[in-house]
């Protein structure tokens, strides 16, 4: 079996981002996203 080892040589930082749902759609409340390495992934 192949073994995968992640060793990129640099640290990837992540940051929680918050958006207002009413400003990006039609719902109320807040949307929580996660930015990893400059890309919003969730």
């Amino acid at each position: 079996d192949a073994e995968f080892r992640h060793d990129s040589g640099y640290e990837v930082h992540h940051q929680k981002l918050v958006f207002f749902a009413e400003d990006v759609g039609s719902n109320k409340g807040a949307i929580i996203g996660l930015m990893v390495g400059g890309v919003v992934i969730a």
């Epitope: 207002f20 749902a21 009413e22 990006v24 109320k28 409340g29």
Partner: nanobody, 124 residues
Framework: EVQLVESGGGLVQPGGSLRLSCAAS????????MGWFRQAPGKEREFVAA????????YYADSVKGRFALSRDNAKNTVFLQMNTLKPEDTAEYLC?????????????????WGQGTQVTVSS
């Protein structure tokens, strides 16, 4: 020219209250999320709270949730930050900021315009 002018800061004892105001001019107020950040000496700028362009949604940092309340008056282009049960760790310069609606609300880089700040000191 866009201007954000904060007022209402001062010295207050622990457990006390303050109400900060931010008056905006030179922008279409109803298109902007309004936020408050704070910065203590030697520390990074910290998100405090934000309110949506319509005023229908607010969001607070965990550190102030349940103690601070943010509101806005779109007729007067003004936002208000009611701060209750203040603690010494709330001591900082408080800055009002405006971000075009739709951008992330809890990061300073989203905010196009900033006020000069008002100092809040919580001490006995």
């Amino acid at each position: 020219e866009v201007q954000l002018v904060e007022s209402g800061g001062g010295l207050v004892q622990p457990g006390g209250s303050l109400r900060l105001s931010c008056a905006a001019s030179g922008l279409t107020f109803t298109l902007y999320t309004m936020g408050w950040f704070r910065q203590a000496p030697g520390k990074e700028r910290e998100f405090v709270a934000a309110i949506s362009a319509s005023g229908g949604t607010t969001y607070y940092a965990d550190s102030v949730k349940g103690r601070f309340a943010l509101s806005r008056d779109n007729a007067k282009n003004t936002v208000f930050l009611q701060m209750n049960t203040l603690k010494p760790e709330d001591t900082a310069e408080y800055l009002c900021a405006a971000a075009f609606r739709g951008f992330a609300i809890n990061t300073p880089t989203s905010y196009n315009y900033w006020g000069q700040g008002t100092q809040v000191t919580v001490s006995s």
